[in-house]
Interface confidence: medium
């Protein structure tokens, strides 16, 4: 006959990017089904995912309810098959997650340049506004709707020609910068929150060069 | 260590113009809004407006954007506030006070205190 | 602009009690409130953000919580160093804006 041994779930980690939250886990099961449970510091315990072969849950719909709140998950081992039996303590066994905040912590997706627009020796290069999947009177929220002015976007720019790159920074979603008559340059984006201590940056978006179909070009 | 320092106290006429400095140091100037909160005798705390260092933009209370101007100086990690016609009851304490992420004050200088009297 | 009302505007309380300081925001501020401690000729010094998230070195006596328009910034067990003025402010909505303050004394 099969074992009820079970054992208990292991790293526990949070993975998140723009609001988009998994919580993973450690080992891949045998015998044994996963239920987690998710709750803030001062709320009350929801089941998600129960009895789950997977090692990941999507937490996200729970976490978006409110980002600026300090989330904690546990994932409790079942055996297979015979969920109401218990560890040797009379519980399941389960395991903590690290405390997990979401608005310190989601990583920053990449970015995407939208548009560039040249008019004369000046460029406007527009960064994509991000969806996210948070809500506020049932429309889901811009990157830029819920960071707000904590969300800077870096640009680096160089002439096609060269590597010597330039930087810009904005807490809009546009960057205004001269450029020289008659140059093609290349762009790249970066979204930064300068004022965390993890997770700061995105990483690089593609890069977009002028020449190609994003741009619009206007000489005056 | 995080450290906002303010220039020292300034007594006023009304109708002039006083200008506070806050020199940062132990973190990234550019990387923290910087905001300035007042403190009459005796009161509660009052918001003013906040600069960005790294643009220059600035957000102010309503209350005040006609008469204060926030600058900063990168090169010096300093950031200034100058508040213009002053009247009596400007007289207060002054600090600066870095913005944390999410919206709190996490660190502050010491307090300049303004005294306007005739 | 957000309302931040404070209660109440005084409160003694004898050393090792529970102080208990309320904030009321005249709308929906989430979870976006700080609090603050003030001692005579000092800068205010941040104890909470989010409601209910301790500052860096803050004793664990000092808790918070309360989302929304009604928030409790807890001491659970009064200190003799625990005396001073406490702030709440909200960080939701520009322009930040504080509450009355509370002053917390020894019975």
């Known amino acids: 006959s099969g074992t009820t041994n079970t054992v208990a779930a292991y790293n526990l980690t949070w993975k998140s990017t723009n609001f988009k939250t998994i919580l993973e886990w450690e080992p891949k099961p045998v015998n044994q089904v996963y239920t987690v449970q998710i709750s803030t510091k001062s709320g009350d315990w929801k089941s998600k995912c129960f009895y789950t072969t997977d090692t990941e849950c999507d937490l996200t719909d729970e976490i978006v309810k409110d980002v600026k709140q300090t989330y904690l998950a546990r994932v409790f081992s079942y055996p297979a098959g015979n969920v109401e039996s218990t560890g040797s303590a009379g519980e399941p066994l389960y395991e903590n997650s690290p405390e997990f905040t979401p608005y310190l912590e989601t990583n920053l997706g990449q970015p995407t340049i939208q548009s560039f627009e040249q008019v004369g020796t000046k460029v406007n290069v527009t960064v994509e506004d991000e969806r996210t999947l948070v809500r506020r009177n049932n429309t889901f929220l811009s990157l830029r709707d819920v960071f707000g002015k904590d969300l800077i976007y870096t640009l680096y720019y160089w002439k096609s020609s060269s590597s010597g790159k330039k930087t810009a920074k904005t807490n809009t979603n546009e960057f205004l910068i001269d450029v020289d008559k008659g140059e093609n340059y290349c762009f790249s984006v970066q979204a930064v929150i300068p004022s965390r201590t993890v997770n700061r940056k995105s990483t690089d978006s593609p890069v977009e060069c002028m020449g190609q179909e994003k741009g619009e070009f206007r000489e005056i | 260590e995080v450290q906002l320092v303010q220039s020292g106290a300034e007594v006023k006429k009304p109708g002039a113009s006083v200008k506070v400095s806050c020199k940062a140091s132990g973190y990234s100037f550019t990387g923290y809004y910087m905001n300035w909160v007042r403190q009459a005798p005796g009161q509660g705390l009052e918001w003013m407006g906040e600069i960005n260092p790294s643009t220059g933009g600035s957000t102010y209370n309503q209350k005040f954007k006609a008469r204060v101007t926030l600058t900063v100086d990168q090169s010096t990690n300093t950031a200034y506030m100058e508040l213009s016609s002053l009247r009596s009851e400007d007289t207060a304490v002054y600090y600066c006070?870095?913005?944390?992420?999410?919206?709190?004050?996490?660190?502050w200088g010491q307090g300049t205190t303004v005294t306007v009297s005739s | 602009d957000i309302v931040m009302t404070q209660s109440p505007d005084s409160l003694a309380v004898s050393l090792g009690e529970r102080a208990t300081i309320n904030c009321k925001a005249s709308q929906s501020v989430s979870n976006g409130i700080a609090w603050y401690q003030q001692k005579p000729g000092q800068p205010p010094k941040l104890l909470i953000y989010f409601a209910s998230n301790r500052y860096t070195g803050v004793p664990d006596r000092f808790s918070g919580s309360g989302s929304g328009t009604d928030f409790t910034l807890t001491i659970s067990s009064l200190q003799a160093e625990d005396v001073a003025v406490y702030y709440c402010?909200?960080?939701?909505?520009?322009?930040?804006?504080f509450g009355g303050g509370t002053k917390v004394e020894i019975k």
């Open positions: 402010q909200q960080d939701y909505s520009s322009p930040w804006t």
């Open positions: 006070a870095r913005r944390e992420l999410g919206g709190p004050f996490g660190y």
